[in-house]
Interface confidence: low
């Protein structure tokens, strides 16, 4: 019988008492085969973290800073359940740390040196750790003691709880530096008052502070937020302009064998029986013998943290950067106006080889990082392990939802000023063999399908989106008799046609022979009835243009396109017979790397782009002989996006809507994780 006990870690007598009450009340409402609670008492949160790592306890609820400690080796804990605040309809699991300024003050984030600062309190998250952590490498050396470096950075501050004797500048704006509400500039409201009164130029608070202190919109309009990209935004645009997004209070468990499903089952049942306004005898979110015991008193309930989410993703790149800077105290040697090498994310073995070659040729401008799937690459870019990669539109959507931005677009047509003119897009088509003359768009049920990969534009999002509108369900593996859609569940019929061997079968990378445009077309040639690809795929792989044994004798005339009106047309008539227009592939990166990725890639394409005439003796960025490694092989150049610099603007309203509709059918664990951070 599996052990269904969750050992909760308590850090005080009062917590232990509440834990025992929790245990006893759960016993009274949960059947004997359900989850149960046991209580383990430790002296501190850090002791609890160590106990969970050592399998002496299973769960504890932590503030964000401690979630970071819990994640670090050798603890390796992960977030499993989040407390939420506000309503069930609009649950808030995060708050945003922001820098508020007066509208007419005219300076940006990178011009804070010499300004006067208002902090909620020394060592507090939004008011100190995050802003000072992010500014850490701009502080004058020596950076230790930190208070002295901060005092020398700003021209005056109010940082309640600081030592006013040793660091008088930190108390200059609030005589005494008192560490309670007796100090009028203490806490969130106090720091904002410090700004409002004109004592300081910037207040480091959380996003809700300004709304809690100024009910009137006209008054709020006198203030702005400083953004990390050195712009300003109105105070209600905090989701797009903040220093960090911080989880409020989170249950953590072991990453391996951590009982995360059991913990969720327990807490989900607990909130049903003892949540807000549920029971008189025992209340989960109330602490009669103290404050915030086991859980925050202000919490309204729990949400399950998506399994794909590790602590780094949960805490977010900015928060992790700030805390790491403070803890490790290391700053890069290079001057900050110089671009560091761009870490390119390469998918599996084949892309890695090409990337390594690029890296050597780039003389230190490009470095390579490997991942096995596109989603793993996106996650690495999010957390700073990698910086950039080129993505199909379907993944540009997921990357955008995860906070990444498009920076350059692949262009596929030769033109005089290629780099200045991003194209409208390519065509997503459905290809069949000419010999299968009875096959149309309207009778695909039961046929064998070939897809570039799950989540990609031409191979999945467009055809399956259209199909979904017709069949109104997501069981595509039942609609087609079998197929190859790399990235599907291994036991799905949509992996049956795939050709990868062993663990590589149906993997969404080049280890699966039927992956990508060329792979999907090969699948059609060898096994399938229909392939969902781009309009250039057939001509690129017929007429001897692809020397592979399976392709060398193929003839374009032996294939036709399926049109949405039920007719068929020759391959060259794609403009009048396609499923939809697809946005070109685009390079994505984090917002903080946007300028450098843009600059370095423009240099790289001038060295190794389409202007290289002989690819047999030289490195060519846009060539991999039909394998589309790192970039599509038909890329002519990488083009500027001009104002299409967000994923919504880049992909266009129509495509975003189409992918949004298909979200019901999404198997993307990363998309689920990212929409948890930003619904």
């Amino acid at each position: 019988v599996p052990d269904k006990t969750v050992r909760w870690c308590a850090v005080s007598e009062h917590e232990a008492t509440k834990c025992q009450s929790f245990r006893d009340h759960m016993k009274s409402v949960i059947p004997s085969d359900g989850p149960s609670v046991a209580c383990v008492k430790k002296a501190s949160y850090l002791d609890c973290i160590r106990a969970i790592a050592a399998n002496e306890a299973d769960a504890v609820t932590l503030d964000a800073g401690l979630v970071y400690d819990a994640y670090l080796a050798p603890n390796n804990l992960k977030p499993v359940v989040a407390e939420f605040y506000g309503s069930k309809e609009d649950p808030q699991t995060f708050y945003y740390a922001v820098a508020v300024v007066k509208k007419d003050s005219g300076f940006q984030m990178n011009q804070l040196r010499g300004k006067k600062s208002c902090h909620t309190g020394l060592g507090r998250s939004a008011g100190w750790n995050i802003p000072i952590g992010l500014l850490y490498c701009d502080l004058p050396e020596p950076r230790k003691p930190l208070e002295k470096a901060v005092a020398n950075f700003f021209s005056g501050s109010c940082a309640p709880c600081a030592d006013g004797t040793d660091f008088p500048q930190l108390c200059q704006l609030c005589p005494g530096c008192g560490c309670s509400t007796l100090n009028q500039y203490f806490g969130y409201s106090g720091a904002f008052k410090c700004l409002k009164d004109g004592a300081g130029d910037v207040a480091f608070v959380k996003h809700s502070t300004i709304f809690e202190n100024l009910a009137n919109k006209a008054d709020r309009d006198q203030y702005e937020l400083l953004c990390l990209d050195n712009t300003r935004k109105p105070v209600d645009e905090y989701k797009d302009c903040h220093l960090a997004q911080v989880p409020s209070h989170t249950v953590v468990a072991r990453s391996m064998g951590g009982k995360e499903d059991l913990i969720w089952e327990l807490l989900n049942q607990a909130q049903e029986h003892f949540g807000k306004d549920k029971s008189k005898e025992f209340q989960l979110f109330s602490s009669p013998h103290g404050k915030d015991l086991l859980f925050k008193d202000s919490a309204h309930g729990f949400l399950k943290v998506p399994p794909r989410m590790d602590a780094k993703m949960y805490l977010g790149y900015e928060y992790v950067t700030a805390i790491r800077n403070l803890r490790e105290g290391t700053c890069p040697e290079a001057p900050t106006d110089e671009c560091k090498p761009v870490k390119w994310c390469a998918l599996s073995h084949h892309e890695r080889l090409k990337c390594d070659e690029w890296s050597v040729n780039s003389v230190g401008k490009i470095e390579c990082v490997s991942a096995e799937t596109t989603e793993d690459c996106i996650a690495k870019i999010m957390n700073g392990e990698a910086d950039a990669m080129s993505l199909d539109g379907g993944f540009v959507y997921i990357a955008g939802k995860c906070g990444l931005v498009p920076v350059l677009a692949e262009n596929y047509n030769k033109s005089d000023n290629c780099e200045d003119t991003p194209e409208a897009g390519y065509f997503a088509i459905a290809v069949v063999k000419k010999s299968a003359s009875d096959l149309t768009w309207d009778n695909l049920k039961g046929k064998k399908s070939c897809h570039t990969a799950v989540g990609r534009t031409a191979g999945w999002n467009i055809p399956m989106g259209l199909l979904y509108n017709k069949i109104n369900h997501c069981r595509f593996d039942e609609f087609f008799s079998e197929g190859c859609a790399p990235g599907s569940k291994k036991d799905s019929s949509l992996c049956k046609l795939c050709m990868g061997s062993g663990l590589n079968l149906c993997e969404p990378n080049n280890k699966e022979g039927y992956y990508g445009y060329t792979g999907a077309f090969r699948c059609l040639v060898e096994k399938g009835d229909v392939a969902f690809v781009k309009h250039q795929t057939v001509p690129q792989n017929t007429g001897g243009k692809n020397p592979d044994p399976w392709a060398k004798n193929l003839n374009e005339k032996d294939y036709e396109l399926l049109c949405l009106d039920g007719t068929r047309k020759p391959v060259e008539e794609y403009a009048n017979c396609h499923l939809a227009r697809a946005p070109n592939h685009a390079v994505v990166t984090r917002k903080d790397k946007e300028a450098c990725v843009h600059k370095i890639l423009r240099q790289q394409q001038h060295l190794f782009g389409s202007n290289v005439t002989d690819c047999s003796g030289n490195f060519c960025l846009f060539r991999s002989e039909t394998k589309d490694l790192l970039f599509r092989d038909d890329t002519v150049c990488l083009a500027k996006l001009h104002d299409r610099n967000t994923y919504e603007k880049y992909l266009g309203e129509e495509y975003v809507k189409a992918v949004g509709n298909l979200r019901k059918c999404s198997t993307s664990s990363l998309l689920e994780a990212c929409t948890f951070r930003r619904p």
Epitope: K511, G513, D548, S616, T626, K627
Partner: nanobody, 122 residues
């Protein structure tokens, strides 16, 4: 297919020298570049140096001035002369060849040998 066979690894003291050789056989007419990459335990693979048929070379910064690649196109061999070796050069060294005829996914266009261990230690 192209088959690659390395020789010449071994144990050497810091500051010492080693020469690695690699012989290519099979579809050698398809090769348009050869070189070496290395992998140290628990580290990412790193390209050490590559050389095209035309003689263009690219060295990793960490080995510049210490390692020299040479190729004999007639004999289809590539050699790596490693001087002033350091403990951080310890790794398995793989010879690789790049093909201008891109074959199928299961027959990759880059080929590599079994690897030869180089250990720099006193």
């Amino acid at each position: 297919q192209v088959k690659l066979e390395e020789s010449g690894g071994g144990l050497v003291q810091p500051g010492g020298s080693l020469r690695l050789s690699c012989a290519a056989s099979g579809n050698v007419f398809t090769i348009d570049a050869m070189g070496w990459y290395r992998q140290a335990p628990g580290k990412e693979r790193e390209v050490v140096v590559g050389m095209t048929n035309g003689g263009k070379t690219n060295y990793a910064d960490s080995v510049k001035g210490r390692f020299t690649i040479s190729r004999d196109n007639a004999k289809n061999t590539v050699s790596l002369q490693m001087n002033s070796l350091k403990p951080e050069d310890t790794a398995v060294y793989y010879c690789y060849a790049r093909s201008k005829l891109i074959a199928t996914i299961n027959n990759p266009y880059d080929y590599w040998g079994q690897g030869t261990q180089v250990t720099v230690s006193s």
